[in-house]
Interface confidence: low
């Protein structure tokens, strides 16, 4: 069978298959996985050796399964993200690995996810996968494997379906601080043109709470029309995108055009189960701008964060709507041979 026809047919068959055919569904998924991964395998076969002398950067990629099938009632995505996405951001900063939440259930808008998944576009192919965390590392060999190992150890802690573990407690404390209930000023920082000034510092501990800094000044109501972009949180200096509101979230003033991304980019403030928007990047800014006028395009919402590593560390893994680097847009990198799902380590739960 012709290769280009085979994959779409497999995917269509998987979509139309009754969910009760568990084994058939699994076999189809494996065949799709095998077929999608074949290009990557060819590349890996050519790169059999590690050059540890020149210490050139290598790219490692692992996909860690989020155990939603075992624990469908537990919101792992919320736990991974933490308040404003800070837990995942800090986890990335601490481990030096890029982490993206991908797969079925990785978009907040369920209807949009289904629509994009059915579109058959390669960049949305991951929406047919199981919900997972993609961990990517780009570093010299020894450092790369060390970072990946650290990342895998840390991510485990977030995949325990416990509502009252240490992570949860830290997140609640942080949330309490962020909402001003632990300071008299209820300070929110100053918001203007979509940028929020709020003092904070990256924690070197696990992706939990940060010790509350002194409260910033009281919040200032933004002039009408400037609430279009979300606030950004200036944590580390090399943070990435400036968010865009969801396409249907029209600006508060008709005809208002969103400000361009600031030269010094900063983290956006995602909340749990993030509600709105992807991120700007050079190539897509105009697209978003146009969407304000037409209100027809819709912005996919994935859980994906940049982190404090050098600007050229990663190619954009993702579709342009949620690219977190400013490098040119490319197709997803080929998975390494090691890039299969890692099963959830807590089988006893």
């Amino acid at each position: 069978m012709e290769e280009e026809k085979y994959l779409p047919e497999l995917m269509a068959e998987k979509d139309s298959l009754d969910p009760s055919f568990v084994h058939a569904s699994r076999l189809l998924a494996e065949e799709i996985e095998k077929f999608q991964g074949s290009d990557g395998k060819k590349e890996d076969e050519e790169k059999k050796y590690l050059d540890v002398i020149s210490n050139k950067n290598i790219k490692l990629s692992e996909r860690v399964l989020i155990p939603v099938k075992q624990y469908p009632k537990f919101n792992f995505v919320g736990k991974l993200l933490g308040p404003r996405g800070n837990s995942l951001k800090r986890l990335q900063e601490e481990t030096g690995a890029k982490m993206s939440i991908l797969g079925k259930g990785s978009m907040r808008d369920k209807a949009k996810e289904e629509e994009l998944r059915k579109s058959g576009e390669a960049k949305y192919a991951h929406l047919s996968d199981e919900l997972h965390v993609l961990i990517e590392v780009f570093a010299p060999p020894g450092e790369a494997y060390s970072r990946m190992s650290h990342a895998l150890e840390e991510i485990k802690k977030f995949l325990v379906p416990d509502y009252n573990d240490e992570i949860r407690q830290e997140q609640l404390r942080e949330l309490s601080y962020l909402n001003g209930s632990e300071d008299s000023g209820r300070g929110r920082g100053i918001r203007g043109r979509g940028i929020r000034i709020a003092p904070t510092a990256p924690s070197r501990g696990r992706g939990g709470a940060i010790p509350p800094p002194p409260p910033p000044g009281r919040g200032v109501l933004t002039p009408r029309g400037s609430t279009v972009t979300r606030g950004a949180l200036p944590v580390p200096p090399v943070a990435r995108g400036v968010p865009t509101p969801r396409a249907r979230g029209a600006p508060t003033v008709p005809g208002y055009r969103a400000p361009p991304p600031p030269a010094h980019e900063a983290y956006e403030e995602y909340g749990y189960d993030d509600g709105y928007g992807g991120e700007y990047d050079d190539q897509t800014y105009e697209t978003y701008d146009n969407s304000y006028a037409t209100q027809t395009q819709s912005v996919p919402e994935y859980y994906d964060y940049g982190h404090g590593v050098s600007e050229d560390a990663y190619d954009s893994y993702a579709p342009e709507e949620w690219a977190t680097t400013r490098s040119s847009l490319k197709a997803p990198p080929q998975r390494s041979a090691r890039g299969g799902y890692r099963e959830h380590p807590y089988g006893r739960y």
């Epitope: 009632k73 537990f74 919320g78 808008d109 962020l178 918001r191 606030g231 189960d273 509600g275 709105y276």
Partner: antibody, heavy 129, light 114 residues
Framework: PVHLVQSGAEVKKPGSSVKVSCKLS????????IIWVRQAPGQGLEWMGT????????NYAEKFQDRVAIVADEATSTVYMEVNSLRSEDTAIYFC??????????????????????WGQGTLVTVSS | DIVMTQSPDSLAVSLGERATINCKSS????????????LAWYQHKPGQPPKLLIY???TRESGVPDRFSGSGSGTDFTLTINSLQAEDVAVYYC??????????FGGGTKVEIK
């Protein structure tokens, strides 16, 4: 106790604007979606728009996009909705409501509009010449 | 947009009898990753704000009497009031939150005493 308190009734002329406020007392403000819903005489509930204060972004129902603005003042835990170019069919009770804290996305807070546990008392806006 | 259609528009039920209200969505509101139905029910009395009764299609809100129950999945949902009381006279609305822009409500069902 947590309350949403809305501003008082308004009588407006066609073509003018109205700004209704909705103040949260005693609860978390920034992280929950606040929606505006209206009920015209003899009609059902109609969603107008949503804001999540921490994001500062608003979503609007298509029919209101050109003439409704929803903004949030985090300092005072207040959301404002302004409706421009009023017409007689805008005569309605306008309600604000805040997303629920109960079992929110299975124990973790979600910054998205879902179901609404806390409602303001409603603001009657009458548009008449 | 997801269109929510309620039936009947109104119904009159004797005190102590059962009232059944149906709600149909134009597309599924069941999300496969968590097997949850993104649907809520509200009670709305004149001069008052709506009151949340049920969320996730079948979870009763705290403080809501157990005579109110929600059922259904996918696109077809039912609110049942067992043993109707005088204070249950109101308009009942279903609301989907599977797609949050726009959030959509059903047209409402008026429940009266026969």
């Amino acid at each position: 106790p947590v309350h949403l308190v809305q501003s008082g009734a308004e009588v407006k002329k066609p073509g003018s604007s109205v700004k209704v406020s909705c103040k949260l007392s005693g609860g978390i403000f920034s992280y929950f979606a606040i929606i505006w819903v209206r009920q015209a005489p003899g009609q059902g509930l109609e969603w107008m728009g949503t804001i999540i204060p921490i994001f500062g972004t608003s979503n609007y129902a298509e029919k209101f996009q050109d003439r409704v603005a929803i903004v949030a003042d985090e300092a005072t835990s207040t959301v404002y909705m302004e409706v421009n170019s009023l017409r007689s069919e805008d005569t309605a009770i306008y309600f604000c409501a805040r997303d629920s804290e109960v079992e929110k996305s299975d124990g973790y807070m979600a910054s998205t509009a879902e179901y609404f546990q806390l409602w303001g008392q409603g603001t009657l806006v009458t548009v008449s010449s | 947009d997801i269109v929510m259609t309620q039936s009947p528009d109104s119904l009159a039920v004797s005190l102590g009898e059962r009232a059944t209200i149906n709600c149909k969505s134009s597309q599924t509101v069941l999300h496969s990753s968590n097997n949850r139905n993104y649907l809520a029910w509200y009670q709305h009395k004149p001069g008052q704000p709506p009151k949340l009764l049920i969320y996730w299609a079948s979870t009763r809100e705290s403080g809501v009497p157990d005579r109110f129950s929600g059922s259904g999945s996918g696109t077809d949902f039912t609110l049942t009031i067992n043993s109707l009381q005088a204070e249950d006279v109101a308009v009942y609305y279903c609301q989907q939150y599977y797609d949050t822009a726009p959030l959509t409500f059903g047209g409402g069902t008026k429940v009266e005493i026969k």
